[in-house]
Interface confidence: low
């Protein structure tokens, strides 16, 4: 059955209640120079509009502090109102390493990110840090790497490994949950000139992730004791017509091409899904596509296999799919899939369908295919036009969390956290934020607060209290380090 009655029950005490933000652009300088500059200035507001130093006057100074960054103050205010236990945000690779290698490290950017993490910890909020978060408008790569063919060039994977190592070294004492790459399975939207470009870029992304994971495993895990994975875009697929076999096959094929494409090599075999490889090969034989998945060497298979500590899924909606034979040598046509927009479904302004039961089906599919592992939903949310009373978002959150709870209580899926997407919206973008672009809170915040404080949807008389030892203690030494280690 698709929809089942709501359940009453609670998530475990160590469940991560999170909110996700995309790339945080680092502030280049703390915006309160008066604390570090002992001079007094007057502003010539009507003349040259410059600051003029007042000679002979010296002010008391103090060391720079994390809260001197205006952005950080804003982030913290929003996070405090969210009452979350975890904050997922992404670093800007291009800001940290503008040259793409370790020859020019932007220490100020790293200090900014360290401040975001350490100030969050003071509020009891742990960070899940994403190293690389490409957006469709911009690949988010340092310029030199972008101009050297980006992810079509295998050396980008090595550059990523060096960048990851730097981040682990600089932030790993405070960060215990890492995402290497956000939604590498959606870079097909960018590398779409040909299927071979798409599969070649994907291969290099897989290698990049595996190199970073193995570097962490070897060099940082013994002392830092964190966990590393990558976040896959993981929408569920349903047959548009449940009575058509070809639609059922198309739905499974969508999951193979979208999720298994990355999950199979990393979680299971070290190689691409056989179903995907065979489907592309059969189209190739029939002259319908010249695409081919890369052949992996034994060493590459060993490199990739097992390089995840948990499963991280970004889930937003369910897609209704049907089979349609498409010619052409591109990823989109290799799949032979057509999407159907079901106008009878509750949908968002960007036409994302609200299909809560899809997330439960997804979680069961992942467990069936890849075993009983810890799963985090690292992004889940919907766009809502309302600037104050965002009722669609409240409905979405309540219903999707209900299905996640069913997966936990009934299906016994090891679900470890849910990260709502996203903290604040960006100007002229679909409205996914709990806060507007000028930091005004929406009413869905109170709803999410209530679910968090109740740990789900408890029975009337059940306690939502957790003892200190049961709560999420993945970073018990972090606060000590925040106080002791200079920022």
């Amino acid at each position: 059955k698709e929809s089942t009655p709501d359940v009453q029950g609670q998530f475990p005490c160590d469940f991560s209640w999170g909110v996700t933000e995309s790339v945080l652009k680092p502030e280049s300088v703390a915006s309160s120079p008066q604390f570090s500059d002992p001079h007094l200035y007057v502003w010539n507001a009507t003349g040259n509009r410059l600051l003029h130093r007042v000679e002979g006057v010296r002010l008391k100074t103090r060391p720079a502090q994390c809260t001197d960054f205006v952005n950080i103050k804003k982030q913290l205010e929003m996070l405090a109102r969210m009452k979350v236990t975890h904050y997922r945000f992404a670093l800007d690779w291009a800001s940290v390493l503008p040259t793409g290698n370790l020859s020019a490290v932007n220490r100020q950017a790293l200090r900014y990110y360290r401040c975001v993490v350490s100030e969050g910890l003071k509020l009891g909020i742990s960070a899940m840090v994403t190293l690389y978060y490409p957006t469709h408008a911009h690949l988010g790569l340092p310029e030199p790497l972008l101009h050297a063919d980006g992810w079509l060039n295998p050396s980008t994977a090595e550059a990523f490994q060096a960048y990851a190592g730097l981040c682990f070294q600089e932030l790993g004492d405070l960060v215990k949950l890492w995402i290497t790459i956000n939604e590498p399975n959606r870079l097909s939207d960018i590398y779409n000139r040909s299927g071979n470009d798409t599969y070649g870029a994907a291969h290099n992304l897989l290698v990049a992730h595996a190199l970073a994971w193995r570097l962490y495993d070897r060099q940082f895990r013994p002392s830092q004791r964190g966990a590393v994975s990558l976040s896959l875009h993981a929408d569920w697929a349903e047959p548009a017509n449940p009575y058509a076999d070809s639609h059922w096959r198309a739905a499974e094929r969508f999951l193979q091409f979208e999720i298994a494409w990355f999950a199979e090599p990393l979680f299971k075999t070290g190689d691409y899904p056989a179903a995907m490889r065979e489907y592309i090969a059969s189209k190739h034989r029939r002259g319908l596509s010249s695409s081919a998945l890369p052949r992996l060497t034994e060493a590459e298979r060993r490199l990739l296999k097992g390089t995840v500590d948990f499963c991280a899924l970004n889930h937003f909606t369910t897609r209704f799919v049907m089979h349609e034979q498409l010619a052409g040598s591109r990823y989109d046509s290799d799949r032979d899939i057509q999407f159907l927009q079901d106008i009878t479904r509750l949908s968002s302004p960007t036409r994302l369908a609200v299909i809560p039961w899809g997330v439960r089906k997804l979680l069961r599919w992942v467990r069936r295919n890849y075993g009983d592992m810890d799963i985090y939903i690292t992004a889940s949310g919907i766009d809502d036009q309302a600037l104050e009373d965002d009722r669609l978002r409240k409905y979405y959150l309540g219903k999707y969390l209900q299905e996640v709870l069913k997966a936990y209580l009934i299906d016994k899926v090891r679900i470890k956290g849910y990260y709502a997407f996203k903290l604040a919206e960006e100007k002229s973008k679909p409205r996914f934020g709990f806060f507007t672009s000028d930091f005004k809170a929406k009413s869905s915040i109170q709803f999410y607060n209530k679910v968090i404080s109740s740990r789900g949807f408890p029975f009337e008389n059940s306690s939502s209290r957790c003892s200190q030892t049961q709560e999420n203690t993945e970073c018990t030494v972090c606060l000590f380090l925040v106080q002791k280690k200079p920022l």
Epitope: L102, E158, Q161, A162, G165, A210, L211, R214, L215, D217, R218, Q219, P222, A299, R302, L303, G306, T307, D309
Partner: antibody
């Protein structure tokens, strides 16, 4: 194919130092650890340490700290081990070995070995 | 340091028979689902050759008559059926923590 080519045998006097090399080919040198292993006649194998040429980080067996120094030259894809204050105890065959994508940290590819003889 | 104790030190085996070599660690070398214990074969004048990695995984190109098993502290290398070319010294090695150490070796002789 992957190859590790070590420098030739060395006959050195007690108290002197020796630097042996291990030239890598057939793979990306900066991606893998190079380990060094000691083998004395009639005895077992001893791990000396590793260097990761990607960032020149090193780890040593405490027993060889101060005795062995590991370095790497990316431009020539060559790893080096320098042994100082040599005594007869240091007479042995020294192997370099590449870790296989350092997940398992097992040594898949080995150099042919360099015999170091310490004798007055 | 983790001490690896191999037994027997010397093992005479007839052609076609089974050879079993044991390796015992002074503490567990298994962590996060893997057993960081590997087996090598060394012949005189040659470098060691990796046979088995992570306790039970056969290195590519190694004949299937070699197999490894075990976890935690107790591990076994089996060779069956033994062939003439298997005469060599066999070492176990762990990489569970630093320093990596090797067992003392087992010399396999063909009777």
């Amino acid at each position: 194919q992957v190859q590790l080519q070590q420098s030739g045998p060395e006959l050195v006097k007690p108290g002197a130092l020796v630097k042996i090399s291990c030239k890598a080919s057939g793979y990306t040198f900066t991606r893998y650890d190079i380990n060094w292993v000691k083998k004395r006649p009639g005895q077992g194998l001893e791990w000396i340490g590793w260097i990761y040429p990607g960032d020149d980080s090193t780890k040593y067996n405490e027993k060889f700290k101060g005795k062995a120094t590991l370095t790497a030259d990316k431009s020539s894809s060559t790893a080096y081990m320098q042994l100082s204050s040599l005594t007869s105890e240091n007479s042995a065959v020294y192997f370099c070995a590449r870790s296989d994508y350092y997940g398992s940290r097992s040594f898949v590819y080995w150099g042919q070995g360099t015999l170091v003889t310490v004798s007055a | 340091d983790i001490v690896l104790t191999q037994s027997p030190a010397s093992l005479p085996v007839s052609l076609g028979q089974r050879a079993t070599i044991s390796c015992r660690a002074s503490k567990s070398v298994s962590t996060s689902g893997y057993s960081y214990l590997h087996w090598y074969q060394q012949k005189p004048g040659q470098p060691p050759k990796l046979l088995i990695y992570l306790a039970s995984n056969l290195e590519s190109g190694v004949p299937a008559r070699f197999s490894g098993s075990g976890s935690g502290t107790d591990f076994t290398l089996n060779i069956h059926p033994v062939e003439e070319e298997d005469a060599a010294t066999y070492y176990c090695q762990h990489s569970g923590e630093l320093p990596y150490t090797f067992g003392g070796g087992t010399k396999l002789e063909i009777k």
